[in-house]
């Protein structure tokens, strides 16, 4: 008996071939001997089966001695043995219809679990193997689960169902809802305008929800909500914003915040959360602000940074085009009695400059100038 695997919702062609390459009488029946379809001369005739409106054949193939049964919009319950009667012989085809669905939404938050459920006909014993977009293989029976979804799990999952040495392939598109970056860091000189961007790693037609940016300033004992906002069909509207600092927010995606100026009291780290409509849980992105200030007071030239810096970062003070006068893995460095000229304060990581502030030291009788 020939075995054919089909997918729920798909169309399948069950073939039946006669030895004579011409149009002759044929009938397709199910295992209960109920007629599905056949022919009367050139006419297609249909029986009283439950497939009536979903069964078809191809007249053009009859002249070649082929008498297919085409079943559209397959259902699991269409799984059956189908019998083609032609030329006083019977051809049997066993059709097994499978369905594979994500039993939650296919749009899932980062960190959530994905469960795939296989629908199969009674008496079948299929095995399933799925391959994620990043090439990870998972195997299972009727259900497959993947916990802690990551951004790289977004895309097409290809699942192969095996039964009777035959296979059928399912493709399921999964969207992991997350920000493009889990964390970002912005380095600014005191007084500069600060731009925070929170690009999403997915696109959907309609995006609705609400969000908030909580900020923990390095100098503050507790965190504080800087801004709350709503998102409706990708349009952003501010609900509430603190007076200090007075953040501004872009009206369109990607989420974009502007801090008028970087000040030491704002240096620290923030957590932007976004709660999406009809989703449990929230999207998170951490953002850090490091602020640099270079000052000269009397005979002391000082460079300081505030905010979350890694211990391996180097803070240096150097006279332009000269070797660094001072270089330390600390958050403040100074030079006593600096010579006149343009001094540079540099924050660097393994030789790569992250932040730079210049200060002009005038001869001792005049006051310093900051460009």
């Amino acid at each position: 008996k020939k075995v054919v695997l089909g997918k729920k919702g798909d169309t399948v062609e069950l073939t039946c071939t006669a030895s004579q390459k011409k149009s002759i009488q044929f009938h397709w029946k199910n295992s209960n001997q109920i007629k599905i379809l056949g022919n009367q001369g050139s006419f297609l005739t249909k029986g009283p089966s439950k497939l009536n409106d979903r069964a078809d054949s191809r007249r053009s193939l009859w002249d070649q001695g082929n008498f297919p049964l085409i079943i559209k919009n397959l259902k699991i319950e269409d799984s059956d043995t189908y019998i083609c009667e032609v030329e006083d012989q019977k051809e049997e085809v066993q059709l097994l219809v499978f369905g594979l669905t994500a039993n939650s939404d296919t749009h899932l938050l980062q960190g959530q679990s994905l469960t795939l459920t296989l629908e199969s006909p009674p008496g079948s014993s299929p095995s399933v193997q799925c391959r994620s977009p990043r090439g990870k293989n998972i195997q299972g029976g009727k259900t497959l689960s993947v916990s802690q979804l990551e951004l790289q799990d977004s895309g097409t999952w290809t699942c192969t169902v095996l039964q009777n040495q035959k296979k059928v392939e399912f493709k399921i598109d999964i969207v992991v809802l997350a920000f493009q970056k889990a964390s970002s860091i912005v380095y600014k000189k005191e007084g500069e305008q600060v731009e925070f961007s929170f690009p999403l790693a997915f696109t959907v037609e309609k995006l609705t929800g609400s969000g908030e940016l909580w900020w923990q300033a390095e100098r503050a004992s507790s965190s504080k909500s800087w801004i709350t906002f709503d998102l409706k069909n990708k349009e952003v509207s501010v609900k509430r914003v603190t007076q200090d600092p007075k953040l501004q927010m872009g009206k369109k995606l990607p989420l974009h915040l502007t801090l008028p100026q970087a000040l030491p009291q704002y240096a620290g780290s923030g957590n932007l959360t976004l709660a999406l409509e009809a989703k449990t849980g929230k999207l998170h992105q951490e953002v850090n602000l490091v602020v640099m200030r270079a000052t000269q007071l009397q005979k002391n030239l000082t460079c300081e940074v505030w905010g979350p810096t890694s211990p391996k970062l180097m803070l240096s003070l150097k006279l332009e085009n000269k070797e660094a006068k001072v270089s330390k893995r600390e958050k403040a460095v100074w030079v006593l009695n600096p010579e006149a000229g343009m001094w540079q304060c540099l924050l660097s990581d393994s030789g790569q400059v992250l932040l730079e502030s210049n200060i002009k030291v005038l001869p001792t009788w005049s006051t310093p100038v900051q460009p």
Epitope: T11, E13, S42, R59, D63
Partner: antibody, heavy 115, light 107 residues
Framework: QVQLQQWGAGLLKPSETLSLTCAVY????????WSWIRQPPGKGLEWIGE???????NYNPSLKSRVTISVDTSKNQFSLKLSSVTAADTAVYYC?????????WGQGTLVTGGG | DIQMTQSPSSVSASVGDRVTITCRAS??????LAWYQHKPGKAPKLLIY???SLQSGVPSRFSGSGSGTDFTLTISSLQPEDFATYYC?????????FGQGTKLEIK
Amino acid sequence: QVQLQQWGAGLLKPSETLSLTCAVYGGSFSGYYWSWIRQPPGKGLEWIGEINHSGSTNYNPSLKSRVTISVDTSKNQFSLKLSSVTAADTAVYYCARVINWFDPWGQGTLVTGGG
Amino acid sequence: DIQMTQSPSSVSASVGDRVTITCRASQDISSWLAWYQHKPGKAPKLLIYAASSLQSGVPSRFSGSGSGTDFTLTISSLQPEDFATYYCQQANSFPYTFGQGTKLEIK
């Protein structure tokens, strides 16, 4: 909702090979036959040939010697190659899904043959 | 090959008119016939299949009849969007063939 999207070179010199591809989105690929049909300027529709997911083909005898239709089930795509084109092959070429009737159709590609 | 002959090759009519287009097959094709509507720059659209079955989403003013060799497409009350070229197609045997088309124009 099944959609067919087709593409390929639109301008050919005499004796070159016409090459078109049609991608099937949002529906079953197996169980159906996938056809190519053309319409020369100011004329009627002409069926070129068809293929199913397993590669079984049927061609119009008038074009059979020059036509090859192939299938790539991994991409849900099928392709048409028509060799040794002439000015008489200038037409809008359509791909379509078929059991007995053509539905739906691709958007059409105007191919200008040489000469 | 089965030849399909449509008549008339063009017809002028007004909105609200009843229009009938005929299609004749060169041999018996029982009910293996479809009708399509084709507008310039667009893909043809299936209207009627199996001679008389209305395709899903097609307005009920379109109807088909006939069997064997003679078939008709009727538009009961012409609407402005119905002005197009109409083709019949036989699915009885390879190669599939179409009628030469009937152009329906505004009077």
